[in-house]
């Protein structure tokens, strides 16, 4: 009689997580009598997956009824596959004995599990940055298999190129994780911008997963300041306006100082949004000119989003007191537009949080 061969026809089988895997095995002879066992791996540490003779294997069912007369089909079906089931499975014939003796093994079938990546999670910088600065966004996705995966970054639909991606682990594993860090240069117009991390994988059937982050969480747009004087009113009161424009986020505190003394402090709230997502705010201060002998130095001090204060000063000339002056005719604008904190020449006057 021919010598027994154990045939495992497929070198590899790929199955989606959650599905069933069929591992085929046939013997070429009824001789010798003895059971079949399935193992994952080889050597002393191999794992018993199914034994025809004994044991409880709730996820494994023989494809062919083991009691079928002259059965030589020892294929099995493993249900509810997870990435942890990946590995090489061996169909092993035993010769009947006390105990049964291992006789011959099939060549093995490698089971790979196709597992979908988790939804990408995009996280931005811990602290806000201003325009022209570069910030990093990180995208992470886990639990996918096989290892091959494609990740792309977009900003407002435009693909980004400045990013670095790692897939771990480097060696063989039941499942993998991807982590990518993209560098994005901010502009003042980015309050409404969005970065998108897109992950494509064989398990997604051409429908990539996306994770998003809003640049509004990462950006700070410092305000422009402008202080102007309105016409002198009949009651010798001058209306001075501080216009704070194009700032984001809304968190802003404005303080008026008269000759260096705090006159009033206000907090911005419930401001209407500009088209670009920034905010504007206007504050007025009435100065009673007749109450002052000398010129009054007014300072609009703005503290935005916990940053160092920005000042804009304005002098109201008490000596010039015609009743019907036009704007700025009775005052001298001594302030500078101090948007750039580094070049602020009034720094020593600023109040820091």
């Amino acid at each position: 009689e021919e010598e027994l061969q154990v045939i495992q026809p497929e070198k590899s089988v790929s199955v989606a997580a959650g599905e069933s895997a069929t591992l085929n095995c046939t013997a070429t002879s009824l001789i010798p009598v003895g059971p079949i066992q399935w193992f994952r791996g080889v050597g002393p540490g191999r794992e018993l997956i199914y034994s025809q003779k004994e044991g409880h294997f709730p996820r494994v069912t023989p494809v062919s009824d083991p009691t079928k007369r002259n059965n030589m089909d020892f294929s099995i079906r493993i249900s509810n596959i997870t990435p942890a089931d990946a590995g090489t499975y061996y169909c092993v014939k035993f010769r009947k004995g006390s105990p049964d003796v291992e006789l011959k093994s099939g060549a093995g079938t490698e089971l790979s599990v196709r597992a979908k990546p988790s939804a990408p999670v995009v996280s931005g910088p811990a602290v806000r940055a201003t325009a022209e600065h570069t910030v990093s966004f990180t995208c992470e996705s886990h639990g996918f298999s096989p290892r091959d995966i494609t990740l792309k970054w977009f900003k407002n639909g435009n693909e980004l190129s400045d990013f670095q991606t790692n897939v771990d682990p480097a060696g063989k594993s039941v499942s993998y994780s991807i982590r990518s860090t993209a560098r994005v240069v901010l502009t003042r117009r980015d309050v409404h911008s969005q970065v998108i991390c897109e992950v494509a994988h064989v398990t997604l059937q051409g429908d990539p997963l996306r994770g998003t982050a809003n640049l509004s969480e990462a950006i700070r747009v410092p305000p422009f300041l402008e202080v102007t004087q309105q016409s002198m009113r009949a009651d010798n009161q001058v209306n001075v306006t501080c216009q704070v424009t194009k700032f984001y986020p809304q968190r802003l505190q404005l303080t008026w100082l008269e000759n260096g003394n705090v006159s009033r402090t206000e907090m911005a709230s419930a401001l209407p949004e500009n088209k670009d997502g920034t905010y504007n705010w206007t504050s007025w201060l009435l100065v009673n000119v007749s109450a002052h002998r000398d010129d009054v130095k007014l300072t609009c001090q703005v503290e935005h989003d916990g940053q160092p204060a920005v000042n804009k000063s304005f002098s109201v000339k008490v000596s010039a007191h015609p009743k019907e002056q036009g704007s700025n005719t009775a005052a001298e604008n001594t302030g500078t537009n101090e948007r750039d904190y580094k070049d602020d020449d009034d720094k020593h006057h600023h109040h820091h949080h």
Epitope: L30, V33, Q52, K53, T67, R69
Partner: antibody, heavy 119, light 110 residues
Framework: QVQLQQPGTELVRPGASVKLSCKAS????????INWVKQRPGQGLEWIAM????????HYNQIFKDKATLTVDKSSNTAYMQLSSLTSGDSAVYYC????????????WGRGTSVTVSS | DIVLTQSPASLAVSLGQRATISCRAS??????????IFWYQQKPGQPPKLLIY???NLDSGVPARFSGSGSGTDFTLNIHPVEEEDAATYYC????????FGGGTKLEIK
């Protein structure tokens, strides 16, 4: 190791019935056929029937079709053979045997139950 | 049904000699290249023990002095050299269809 346990003796009255048991251990009960064989004192072996414990499929020797009924209890890994309308001709040793190769052979045997039909 | 006829019904063989037992089937018990004949040994007060399966294959733990041969309808069990412990009754069984046993051959050791 494979074991098939059978009670040693059964004494029954003519016309009565007896239910013989065969408790299996050391293997997956539902994966192998159980055969029943009769041997009268000083005589040869007679195959009675076989049962597949997984689904209770049975095959009978036509001679014993009206005499023997095979059943299994999967929860206790036990095979049963009920013999009805007993006569002195049913006095014999009854063996259960397990078919390990699905070849309709008898690889492992119980020690047998001696049934005596006597008034 | 396939009828198996064993011969002789009994035989006595000297220690160390060859014992040959024949089993003839009323029709072929071969199928798909296999010969569905099995041989059993039974000693008094014990259940039968499988010796040979599919005509020529020694079961686990059976001494090599036992051998089986034959095909189609004619099969033979050989024991050589016979030992004292081989005194027993030997049965052939087929499984080409539902099983049946031969009538048995009683072997005595001289």
């Amino acid at each position: 190791q494979v074991q098939l346990q059978q009670p040693g003796t059964e004494l029954v009255r003519p016309g009565a019935s007896v239910k013989l048991s065969c408790k299996a251990s050391g293997y997956t009960f539902t994966n192998y056929w159980i055969n029943w064989v009769k041997q009268r004192p000083g005589q040869g072996l007679e195959w009675i029937a076989m049962i597949d414990p997984s689904d209770s499929e049975t095959h009978y020797n036509q001679i014993f079709k009206d005499k023997a009924t095979l059943t299994v209890d999967k929860s206790s890994n036990t095979a049963y053979m009920q013999l009805s309308s007993l006569t002195s001709g049913d006095s014999a040793v009854y063996y259960c045997a397990m078919d390990y190769g699905s070849l309709y052979a008898m690889d492992y045997w119980g020690r047998g139950t001696s049934v005596t039909v006597s008034s | 049904d396939i009828v198996l006829t064993q011969s002789p019904a009994s035989l006595a063989v000297s220690l160390g000699q060859r014992a040959t037992i024949s089993c003839r089937a009323s029709k072929s018990v071969s199928s798909s290249g296999y010969n569905y004949i099995f041989w059993y040994q039974q000693k008094p007060g014990q259940p039968p023990k499988l010796l040979i399966y599919l005509a020529s294959n020694l079961d686990s733990g059976v001494p090599a002095r036992f051998s089986g041969s034959g095909s189609g309808t004619d099969f033979t069990l050989n024991i050589h050299p016979v030992e004292e412990e081989d005194a027993a009754t030997y049965y052939c069984q087929h499984s080409r269809e539902l099983p049946t046993f031969g009538g048995g051959t009683k072997l005595e050791i001289k």
